[in-house]
Interface confidence: low
Amino acid sequence: QDDDFFHELPETFPSDPPEPLPHFLIEPEEAYIVKNKPVNLYCKASPATQIYFKCNSEWVHQKDHIVDERVDETSGLIVREVSIEISRQQVEELFGPEDYWCQCVAWSSAGTTKSRKAYVRIAYLRKTFEQEPLGKEVSLEQEVLLQCRPPEGIPVAEVEWLKNEDIIDPVEDRNFYITIDHNLIIKQARLSDTANYTCVAKNIVAKRKSTTATVIVYVNGGWSTWTEWSVCNSRCGRGYQKRTRTCTNPAPLNGGAFCEGQSVQKIACTTLCPVDGRWTPWSKWSTCGTECTHWRRRECTAPAPKNGGKDCDGLVLQSKNCTDGLCMQTAPDSDDVALY
């Protein structure tokens, strides 16, 4: 790359009136070679009588420069711009610990100015992620951490996360948080967060996807409240009462645990047997009263009804006509009825 031309370049060029030192309007920027595509480095300086590139401390051949020159209308100073092309082969042929670099050197009558070093690197992105996310089953509202360390690459890969192929935007959904080291945090897992999550690494060379991590948000079952105790199932004597509950508060979901414990509880109960009422025998007929009737009675006490037993059917009191005893018979008139 050395050329005798550059050995003869003076430190300054005699000129009148004196010029300022060259000032870089544009400095070369770092560049990446993708596959076999060469890169262009470009710089621009004013005032500049000469401008050339130096790469890895060696001058680039004059014929490899594309130079343009013009006069700045406002300042009247000469503006020079230059570009060179760097191939993959050139970068690969460099031996030593340092990366391939180039810098611009511009001259004016006042002296020389060097631009910053622009590094030229071969871009790549390895295929294998250094850490891939781990699928998990998590309970509702639990925090979930999905880790991702992207494959090694130049330039360093950017990372984004996909939820079922859709890009996660933590600004849009505040339940997601992406840490500085590319981990995805689901702050409180929701049922809607049950999905396939993929870490995507990309740079100018390629885009790589991690293996998919399946996150399943499960719900453990919870018991409903107990029903009221049933009535004793025996109408008479020993039996049981029961109450029930169901595993529906909530029902288990996505492989969540079924409720532990009993869904039915029973307790012993004793119901007093009902006793139906029965009549006592009729009493003797009473003596015949003044109204020519006599009566007899009985009571529902042999036994009396108990514990919801049936009452006795029929009359407590019976009366009928009589004509003996104190019965006073009178002739019938329109107001009286004789009882026989």
Epitope: G135, K136, Q147, N196, A213, T214
Partner: antibody
Framework: QVQLQESGPGLVKPSETLSLTCTVS????????WSWIRQPPGKGLEWIGY???????NYNPSLKSRVTISVDTSKNHFSLKLSSVTAADTAVYYC?????????????WGQGTLVTVSS | DIQMTQSPSSLSASVGDRVTITCRAS??????LNWYQQKPGKAPKLLIY???SLQSGVPSRFSGSGSGTDFTLTISSLQPEDFATYYC?????????FGGGTKVEIK
Amino acid sequence: QVQLQESGPGLVKPSETLSLTCTVSGGSISSYFWSWIRQPPGKGLEWIGYIHNSGTTNYNPSLKSRVTISVDTSKNHFSLKLSSVTAADTAVYYCARGRGMATLPFDYWGQGTLVTVSS
Amino acid sequence: DIQMTQSPSSLSASVGDRVTITCRASQSISSYLNWYQQKPGKAPKLLIYAASSLQSGVPSRFSGSGSGTDFTLTISSLQPEDFATYYCQQSYSTPLTFGGGTKVEIK
């Protein structure tokens, strides 16, 4: 009660492929993470990898280039293939169920099967 | 990978003793830690998950504590059936890794 049972040859020749199957009974293969773990004689436990019934796999990077884990939900079993084996792969191989939750504990294990790599 | 370091690697104790096993992670793993018991010729058995939750059917003399990088398994009163090897396991990130084990022997 969930039960896991490993099956496969107890002797494999160097450079060949080790193949094991784990049959799951008493429960569904769905919604869990099914792992293979091995233990060389007199040594500690080493996780090989897992598969979810969705087909998602995750392998130990130290074995990744040689491991394949697959699942057959219709037969309720999952399988391990480890290629290019050497004597260093001699171990008791366990299949285990990862119960999920954030800490992925292995709550059910097979009884283990000893695989010897020898010519 | 996250390294899990258990200590001690073995200990001798008597029935009725209080036994403590520690597990240290090479980086913070929150509460993503499980403990297992393994007896010779048998598969490991889950004792504690999520650092401190007791697995169903495990006696209450087993308890777990800790968060971040330092965790402890405690057996409050050692029983004859507790002589075994105990392992911790992290699931903060893959690859899932186990501690080297602590063998509890009869004094």
